[in-house]
């Protein structure tokens, strides 16, 4: 029989009276072979990190600040809980640290030095550690001590809780920095008011403080964000302006053998059985012998984190950046005008090659990582072990809601103005045999599919979002008798054609050999009845022109396409036969790399790009016969995106609204994961 | 296809040098990027030094200042001289002429180079 008893550890004499009494009353109301509770007392948060670690434990609810140490070495430990605060239908299970300031001040975030700073209390989170964090490598040096750092930074501040004494400067507008709410500048709202006040010049706060100290919208409109891309924003913009987004309390286990499903079924019943009045004998949110004693008695329930989500992704970039900064203290020696190495990121091994083959002969300019999947790479992007990679339309949609913007397009028209012209997109065709004469688009059930791979555009996420519209379910393993899907689960029909050994089936990556356009069309070629791809695969794969054995003989007549009315027509007419318009392929990144991304691989491809005549003894950034690698072989420049620098802008309206059409669907664990973040 | 041997390896003591060799033969007319891998037991294949047809030259963070890659183009050879070999250093070393390898997973025999007292 599995032990279903989730070990809580409890940090005081009080917290463990209160799991006793938790064990206990959920004795009284779960089946016997249901999760049960133990109790495991320890002297400090750290000590219970460590106990859990050791399999000691099993759980322990803590703030950010101790997440991150939970998921340092050697603890590697995992959210995998949060509590949420107001309602179960708006629930609120992060807050966001800001930076306010009044509106007609006319500074950005790197023009703060000089200017005076309200704080609400030195080592909280919003006030002190976030932003300073994010400033540390702007301190004047020696950073340690860091008060002093921080008050030669500023001219002046209050720092409630900082020592008066020895850092004057940090107790100016506070006279005697008091730590409790005698100091009227101490906290959230006594931050606010040194604002306010005209004390100082800018407040560190989190974004609910303004809301609750100024309920008139006219009297808000007289104060803005600082963004950290040296921009402002409006205060109700909170989510796209902030310092960071930090989760407010959180259950972590350990990442392997965690019992992390069991940890969720024992919180969702005592939720439903102790939650916010639901019992008078016990109540899981109060503490009548103390103050948020195992969970903090303002929540108001649990949520389940999403089980792709590890503590960086759950920090969030911005937040492991700055804990990290005060934590270890290292700032980079180049000047921070100057632009870092790009870290390209590569899917598996082939890819891999060719980034190695263009770091070389970009001169350090270009570096590589590699991951095996593209929502991989999407997360090596997020928490900053990569910095850029060029996605397919599908992916460019999972990145933007990861918090990631395109930063330039695949042009794939030759014109004279190449990099400041964005083109309007490619279309998304389905592909048969000629000699397949009585196939149509309305008769493809249980017909055998080829796809690029699950959640691109046109080889998955335009036919399927179709198809949807049609079956009303998201069944398409059953729709299709077998095909070959990158990315589907494995046991799954749409794995079947796959021609990947041993793993590597159905991988979404080279590995697989129906994976890709190209891949794709193969299937076609050797085993299936349609194809799912783009308008040019057909051409740039037959007369020739793939020198493949699979391919070399192939002829562009042999091949129709399916129109959505039924009808068929020659490959060349895709303009009057396709199933959608697709955007380009587009690099992404992360909004604070925007720039360098930007400048340098402009540089990159005037070297490396279109203009480069002879492949054959030179490095080529656009080609790999075929195969795609890093960019799409028929891309002819990176262009400028201009306006069009969000996800929303890039993709169309269209098409975000077809592919959120297609989120119930979804087998993303990253697009579930960055909509808990961001729902 | 392009055919690379490479040679050179051998047993050496921490501190001391090696040279390895790789000669290339096949249709070297497209030969452009070279560069050195090296794969140590249970680890990945990682890229060591790099060296384009016009002799510009990038080495892996790890290597700098100790490997020196060069290359012969009248003699379709490339080198590395290897100074100051630490036990991390011990590998496998391939040498690999791009256009060929990330298209058809071409790689040559390697040669063991093994560093201990």
């Known amino acids: 029989v599995p032990d279903k008893t989730v070990r809580w550890c409890a940090v005081s004499e009080h917290e463990a009276t209160k799991c006793q009494s938790f064990r206990d009353h959920m004795k009284s109301v779960i089946p016997s072979d249901g999760p049960s509770v133990a109790c495991v007392k320890k002297a400090s948060y750290l000590d219970c990190i460590r106990a859990i670690a050791a399999n000691e434990a099993d759980a322990v609810t803590l703030d950010a600040g101790l997440v991150y140490d939970a998921y340092l070495a050697p603890n590697n430990l995992k959210p995998v809980v949060a509590e949420f605060y107001g309602s179960k239908e708006d629930p609120q299970t992060f807050y966001y640290a800001v930076a306010v300031v009044k509106k007609d001040s006319g500074f950005q975030m790197n023009q703060l030095r000089g200017k005076k700073s309200c704080h609400t209390g030195l080592g909280r989170s919003a006030g002190w550690n976030i932003p300073i964090g994010l400033l540390y490598c702007d301190l004047p040096e020696p950073r340690k001590p860091l008060e002093k750092a921080v008050a030669n930074f500023f001219s002046g501040s209050c720092a409630p809780c900082a020592d008066g004494t020895d850092f004057p400067q940090l107790c100016q507008l506070c006279p005697g920095c008091g730590c409790s709410t005698l100091n009227q500048y101490f906290g959230y709202s006594g931050a606010f008011k040194c604002l306010k006040d005209g004390a100082g010049d800018v407040a560190f706060v989190k974004h609910s403080t303004i809301f609750e100290n100024l309920a008139n919208k006219a009297d808000r409109d007289q104060y803005e964000l600082l963004c950290l891309d040296n921009t402002r924003k409006p205060v109700d913009e909170y989510k796209d302006c902030h310092l960071a987004q930090v989760p407010s309390h959180t259950v972590v286990a350990r990442s392997m053998g965690g019992k992390e499903d069991l940890i969720w079924e024992l919180l969702n019943q005592a939720q439903e059985h102790f939650g916010k009045d639901k019992s008078k004998e016990f109540q899981l949110f109060s503490s009548p012998h103390g103050k948020d004693l195992l969970f903090k008695d303002s929540a108001h329930g649990f949520l389940k984190v999403p089980p792709r989500m590890d503590a960086k992704m759950y920090l969030g970039y911005e937040y492991v950046t700055a804990i990290r900064n005060l934590r270890e203290g290292t700032c980079p020696e180049a000047p921070t005008d100057e632009c870092k190495p790009v870290k390209w990121c590569a899917l598996s091994h082939h890819e891999r090659l060719k980034c190695d083959e263009w770091s070389v002969n970009s001169v350090g300019k270009i570096e590589c990582v590699s991951a095996e999947t593209t929502e991989d790479c999407i997360a090596k992007i997020m928490n900053g072990e990569a910095d850029a990679m060029s996605l397919d339309g599908g992916f460019v949609y999972i990145a933007g809601k990861c918090g990631l913007v395109p930063v330039l397009a695949e042009n794939y028209n030759k014109s004279d103005n190449c990099e400041d012209t964005p083109e309007a997109g490619y279309f998304a065709i389905a592909v048969v045999k000629k000699s397949a004469s009585d196939l149509t688009w309305d008769n493809l059930k249980g017909k055998k599919s080829c796809h690029t791979a699950v959640g691109r555009t046109a080889g998955w996420n335009i036919p399927m979002g179709l198809l949807y519209n049609k079956i009303n379910h998201c069944r398409f393993d059953e729709f299709f008798s077998e095909g070959c899907a990158p990315g589907s689960k494995k046991d799954s029909s749409l794995c079947k054609l796959c021609m990947g050994s041993g793993l590597n089936l159905c991988e979404p990556n080279n590995k697989e050999g129906y994976y890709g356009y190209t891949g794709a069309f193969r299937c076609l070629v050797e085993k299936g009845d349609v194809a799912f791809v783009k308008h040019q695969t057909v051409p740039q794969n037959t007369g020739g022109k793939n020198p493949d054995p699979w391919a070399k003989n192939l002829n562009e007549k042999d091949y129709e396409l399916l129109c959505l009315d039924g009808t068929r027509k020659p490959v060349e007419e895709y303009a009057n036969c396709h199933l959608a318009r697709a955007p380009n392929h587009a690099v992404v990144t992360r909004k604070d790399k925007e720039a360098c991304v930007h400048k340098i691989l402009r540089q990159q491809q005037h070297l490396f790009g279109s203009n480069v005549t002879d492949c054959s003894g030179n490095f080529c950034l656009f080609r790999s016969e075929t195969k795609d690698l890093l960019f799409r072989d028929d891309t002819v420049c990176l262009a400028k995106l201009h306006d069009r620098n969000t996800y929303e802008k890039y993709l169309g309206e269209e098409y975000v609204k077809a592919v959120g059409n297609l989120r119930k669907c979804s087998t993303s664990s990253l697009l579930e994961a960055c909509t808990f973040r961001r729902p | 296809q392009v055919q690379l041997v490479e040679s050179g390896g051998g047993l050496v003591q921490p501190g001391g040098s090696l040279r390895l060799s790789c000669a290339a033969s096949g249709s070297i007319f497209s030969i452009n990027t070279m560069a050195w891998y090296r794969q140590a037991p249970g680890k990945q294949r990682e890229l060591v030094a790099g060296?384009?047809?016009?002799?510009?030259?990038t080495y892996a963070g790890s290597v700098k200042g100790r490997f020196t890659i060069s290359r012969d183009n009248a003699k379709n050879t490339v080198y590395l001289q290897m100074n100051s070999l630490k036990p991390e250093d011990t590998a496998v070393y391939y040498c690999?002429?791009?256009?060929?390898?990330?298209?058809?997973?071409?790689w040559g025999q390697g040669t063991q180079v093994t560093v201990s007292s």
């Open positions: 060296i384009t047809r016009s002799g510009t030259t």
């Open positions: 690999t002429d791009y256009s060929s390898s990330y298209y058809q997973d071409y």
